[in-house]
């Protein structure tokens, strides 16, 4: 069964800046990755970025930089300032659509005890 992993890290240099990394463990052709916060995309979450392997990347504030790390993993940096900036207990979710298996998603947040720079 395919799985999705999610890591959330607070940047040591900018305490309200986050890096989210997500990866897909499974076969099939990854067609789309959707990153959201505040819950899964289908359950009230707000989309931060959509990454397509051929048609490019779309991102919305406070997302600063979304990119493919490998063919099956992505990373997203969030801006740390402004009214829409995330807080330490924000939930981030990644949904990988793989053809023809379907969609697989997982969520993660910064552990409450984490020091800046530690990965979840």
């Amino acid at each position: 069964t395919p799985e999705v992993w999610v890591q959330v890290r607070m940047e040591a240099t900018e305490l309200s800046s986050f890096t989210i990394r997500c990866g897909f463990l499974g076969s099939g052709s990854i067609s789309l990755v959707t990153v959201s916060w505040g819950g899964p995309n289908g359950a009230g979450g707000t989309t931060l970025a959509v990454l397509h392997p051929e048609r490019g990347i779309r991102q919305w504030a406070p997302a600063r930089q979304a990119r493919w790390e490998t063919q099956s993993s992505i990373s997203l940096i969030l801006e740390g300032s402004g009214a829409s900036s995330p807080c330490a207990n924000t939930t981030f979710c990644c949904k990988f659509a793989s053809f023809p298996e379907g969609s697989w998603e997982a969520c993660g947040s910064l552990p409450p005890s984490s020091d800046p720079g530690l990965s979840a």
Epitope: E54, R55, A97, P100, G102, S103
Partner: antibody
């Protein structure tokens, strides 16, 4: 304008074979996953086969596994369905459809359908 | 396989009526639900994707809602051209499965 045109349907005896074709135009065929969906007379819709954009991944439900083979030729903008060991219950209109990644794999374009009748 | 149970299977209504069709999935399908309209002898046409997004050219009287396992297609004010059969579909896990259809007829 996106167009999908099926051909190859007809009357065939039980145990016989048919090869359906779907000619695509108006879009970059190699960028889209494709499927065959059938509809028996007066019945609902059933996915019978799916293939990824590069042709590397395929899917078949148990009802047709081992009898049907989906393939595509991206150079010819064509999708195929080879149907062997046909049964009376395979009688249906067969539609070629295109999956849109950005729409959660919803099928945003369909052909007009080709009728396959399996009868002695 | 994920089952999509659609209700009602048939429905009689008049022009101008507000109509609701429901679809229940046997397990959570996130927001990967689409709705299609099919007229006799024609191919299905995509109406709604991702639960609530109208496809290009679909009139605003069509709307979708729901989450998890329960989804709804609403036609706010029926027009003569809306009498057709409607199918829900989940595209969350293969095989993509469809509801059995709702035939909307003129009262």
């Amino acid at each position: 304008e996106v167009q999908l045109v099926e051909s190859g349907g007809g009357l065939v005896k039980p145990g016989g074979s048919l090869r359906l074709s779907c000619a695509a135009s108006g879009f970059t065929f190699s960028s889209y996953h494709m499927s065959w969906v059938r509809q028996a007379p007066g019945k609902g819709l059933e996915l019978v086969s799916a293939i990824s954009r590069d042709g590397d991944s395929t899917y078949y439900p148990d009802t047709v596994k081992g009898r049907f083979t989906i393939s595509r030729d991206n150079a010819k903008n064509s999708l195929y369905l080879q149907m062997n060991s046909l049964r009376a219950e395979d009688t249906a209109v067969y539609y070629c459809s295109r999956h849109e990644d950005y729409f959660g794999f919803a099928m945003d374009s369909w052909g007009q359908g080709t009728l396959v009748t399996v009868s002695s | 396989d994920i089952q999509m149970t659609q209700s009602p299977s048939s429905l009689s209504a008049s022009v101008g009526d507000r109509v609701t069709i429901t679809c229940k999935a046997s397990q959570s399908v996130s927001n990967d639900v689409a709705w299609y309209q099919q007229k006799p002898g024609k191919a299905p046409k995509l109406l709604i994707y991702y639960v609530s997004n109208r496809f290009t050219g679909v009139p605003s009287r069509f709307s979708g809602s729901g989450s998890g396992t329960d989804f709804t297609l609403t036609i706010s004010s029926l027009q003569p051209e809306d009498f057709a059969t409607y199918f829900c579909q989940q595209a969350y896990r293969s095989p993509w499965t469809f509801g059995q259809g709702t035939k909307l007829e003129i009262k």
